[in-house]
């Protein structure tokens, strides 16, 4: 039975040109995390494999940085980065857990600064 839950940063906003940290945390399970995938609208951004480390998709190499931890840092944000992001935790023996984050990239300094993991 899958008992775990994923906590995420939820809905966050950031300024165009800035950076943001996408962060998820899996709790309430003793399952072993074998890999975390970060996706945006069915596009794979990055993989963090428990044994092998990080793989960043070539098309995102210039703007995506691994970490902190199992999180992902998006840099040089554009308005086109607005949308849903998913952290997909592959675990053993539980299976797959998915968390959702909605990022809004704003044109000016109207970005809210309430996000817990946001880089100022």
């Amino acid at each position: 039975m899958m008992t775990g839950t994923i906590e995420t940063t939820g809905n966050i906003s950031a300024e165009k040109g800035g950076s943001i940290i996408l962060q998820c945390h899996l709790s309430s399970t003793t399952a072993q995390v074998t890999q975390v995938n970060w996706e945006q609208q069915d596009q794979l951004l990055a993989i963090c494999n428990a044994d092998l480390g990080w793989h960043i998709s070539p098309s995102f190499k210039d703007r995506v940085a691994p970490g902190p931890g199992l999180g992902l840092t998006l840099q040089s944000l554009t308005v086109n980065d607005t949308g849903e992001y998913f952290c997909i935790y592959h675990t053993y023996p539980d299976g797959t857990y998915t968390g959702r984050i909605f990022l809004e990239v704003l044109e000016s300094s109207v970005a809210e600064h309430g996000a817990r993991f946001q880089i100022p």
Epitope: N37, L52, H55, T96
Partner: antibody, heavy 122, light 107 residues
Framework: QVQLVQSGAEVKKPGASVKVSCKAS????????MGWVRQAPGQGLEWMGI????????SYARKFQGRVTMTRDTSTSTVYMELSSLRSEDTAVYYC???????????????WGQGTTVTVSS | DIQMTQSPSSLSASVGDRVTITCRAS??????LNWYQQKPGKAPKLLIY???SLQSGVPSRFSGSGSGTDFTLTISSLQPEDFATYYC?????????FGGGTKVEIK
């Protein structure tokens, strides 16, 4: 040219261990992950695990965990695959294969060794 | 582990035929799908990586398509040297599992 040369055929008794070597040449050894794949007679391909030759990190298929050890010797550009507690079902051709892309693993294996036949028989 | 299912397991075709082999993953693997060709007594050879990218030196009659869970390898005009066994492999999530193989035989 890029080449992987494996050690010769082995005949082992059940319960024994075997260590297969794979010597790389023609490229920067530490920059490419190396995988191991086996093929039992008349059967398909079975992925066993992968090693990062620069840092020595490994990932093993759960089926082989506890029985397989992959290591590397950077001074000789050689990776090793040791399989212990051999049984008859381990009779197979064992291949080493290099990941296609430097410092990454998800894009297939483009260079393969010639294969090492391991026979387990009492 | 992700299961990879290939179909058909074998097929008979003639030189010049268009041949299609399919591979289905038990869960989404994005585009992390590779195709290999293996001839008897030989090591596998990489044909296609990342679902649709042709490996250097591989003839253009080979092509790959698909994403998510459903993938296809197509040989547009089968040549005598193409009679072999073909395997798909997912490389998204360890263990990087293979399909059961498709043997392409001469009709």
């Amino acid at each position: 040219q890029v080449q992987l040369v494996q050690s010769g055929a082995e005949v082992k008794k059940p319960g024994a261990s075997v260590k297969v070597s794979c010597k790389a040449s023609g490229y920067t050894f530490g920059s490419y992950y190396m995988g191991w794949v086996r093929q039992a007679p008349g059967q398909g391909l079975e992925w066993m695990g992968i090693i990062d030759p620069s840092g020595g990190r490994t990932s093993y298929a759960r089926k082989f965990q506890g029985r397989v050890t992959m290591t590397r010797d950077t001074s000789t550009s050689t990776v090793y695959m040791e399989l212990s507690s051999l049984r008859s079902e381990d009779t197979a051709v064992y291949y080493c294969a290099r990941a296609r892309t430097p410092s990454s693993w998800p894009y297939g294996m483009d260079v393969w060794g010639q294969g090492t036949t391991v026979t387990v028989s009492s | 582990d992700i299961q990879m299912t290939q179909s058909p397991s074998s097929l008979s075709a003639s030189v010049g035929d268009r041949v299609t082999i399919t591979c289905r993953a038990s869960q989404s693997i994005n585009s992390y799908l590779n195709w290999y060709q293996q001839k008897p007594g030989k090591a596998p050879k990489l044909l296609i990586y990342a679902a649709s990218s042709l490996q250097s030196g591989v003839p253009s009659r080979f092509s790959g398509s698909g994403s998510g869970t459903d993938f296809t390898l197509t040989i547009s005009s089968l040549q005598p040297e193409d009679f072999a066994t073909y395997y798909c492999q997912q490389s998204l999530l360890t263990p990087f599992t293979f399909g059961g193989g498709t043997k392409v035989e001469i009709k």
